[in-house]
Amino acid sequence: APTSSSTKKTQLQLEHLLLDLQMILNGINNYKNPKLTRMLTFKFYMPKKATELKHLQCLEEELKPLEEVLNLAQSKNFHLRPRDLISNINVIVLELKGSETTFMCEYADETATIVEFLNRWITFCQSIISTLT
């Protein structure tokens, strides 16, 4: 059973992940970002279901493609290089989902834009945080 300290740790990690995803979204949606049109042409894959921490496997599997698209954006739109940003996210995701459980991600048939993809995972973080508080 999760202890209050482990719940607190999970909540902090989710809040960190949420902030990172929001930072990326803000950088992309920045009105000065001339790359938005180009970035929106790239397809991302969404989970059929995302209600538990194990479903973060679906986010982990899309982090490399996310990094590739972020590489298109002007570096000044973000505080960190895409590689460092994604690396930070990856560390949090691995800790949150746990490495001992092997979960096969199931993807939805429809693809999403980078904005829809980020919004979906932001909503996921917010929803899990709300169940923990």
């Epitope: 001339p34 790359k35 894959y45 899309e62 490399k64 493609p65 590489n71 002007q74 991600c105 993807y107």
Partner: antibody, heavy 121, light 113 residues
Framework: EIQLQQSGPELRRPGSSVKLSCKAS????????IHWVRHRPEHGLEWIGW????????RYAQKFQSKATLTADTSSNAAYMQLSSLTPEDTATYFC??????????????WGQGTLVTVSS | DIVMTQSPFSLAVSEGEMVTINCKSS????????????LAWYQQKPGQSPKLLIY???TGQSGVPDRFIGSGSGTDFTLTISDVQAEDLADYYC?????????FGAGTKLELK
């Protein structure tokens, strides 16, 4: 028809620099990234970097960061690569290339014919 | 960077033979979301620019003869040329574009016996 036309062969002295051109036709250069690739027979193919002609944003492979400078001129629908502080190791054929369409960054589907750069004293 | 290990370095063949060229990546090139491997194969003849043969590991580029077949997934990939023709004598390279920077294999030279 999409075509990339590159400038002719160049002979340079060590320590000098050279600027190669890649003129696009059959599409608007701002529609896609332009990549540059080096070919040396004994080393194979190496990716140098890309430029987004739309805003001049560039990315380089680490080893070419201080060697190559990529630019583009949308009015002439062309991309350029300047190579500086040339050494005999820079003797190679340099290609410009672009991907299948604008929804791809890679792979390289359309290539220029290549420009041979020879560095010799 | 992802390292692409290509083998063999060279290959001497007779016309009509079948050949296989292998490429191994230092990490998986499979994107789970679309089940596509971000690997391409190129042919380069002397004095010419590389020509895209196969992308996504197994999709033939338009106009490429169907004797060129790409297969494999994850970290192990193969380019098979069935019924080799004299015009197929060239250098062949694999390219991974799953992660920046894109990296090529060292190449395989296909020569006539």
């Amino acid at each position: 028809e999409i075509q990339l036309q590159q400038s002719g062969p160049e002979l340079r002295r060590p320590g000098s620099s050279v600027k190669l051109s890649c003129k696009a036709s059959g599409y608007n250069i701002t529609d896609n990234l332009i990549h540059w690739v080096r070919h040396r027979p004994e080393h194979g193919l190496e990716w140098i970097g890309w430029i987004d002609p739309e805003d001049g944003e560039t990315r380089y492979a680490q080893k070419f960061q201080s060697k190559a400078t990529l630019t583009a001129d949308t009015s002439s629908n062309a991309a350029y690569m300047q190579l500086s502080s040339l050494t005999p190791e820079d003797t190679a054929t340099y290609f410009c290339a672009r991907s299948l369409d604008s929804t791809y960054i890679y792979p390289f589907a359309y290539w220029g014919q290549g420009t041979l750069v020879t560095v010799s004293s | 960077d992802i390292v692409m290990t290509q083998s063999p370095f060279s290959l001497a063949v007779s016309e009509g033979e079948m050949v296989t060229i292998n490429c191994k990546s230092s990490q998986s090139l499979l994107r789970s979301g679309n089940q596509k491997n971000y690997l391409a194969w190129y042919q380069q003849k002397p004095g010419q620019s590389p020509k895209l043969l196969i992308y996504y590991a197994s999709t033939g580029q338009s106009g490429v003869p169907d004797r060129f077949i790409g297969s494999g997934s994850g970290t192990d990939f193969t380019l098979t040329i069935s019924d080799v023709q004299a015009e197929d004598l060239a250098d062949y390279y694999c390219l991974q574009h799953y992660q920046s920077p894109p990296t090529f294999g060292a190449g395989t030279k296909l020569e006539l016996k």
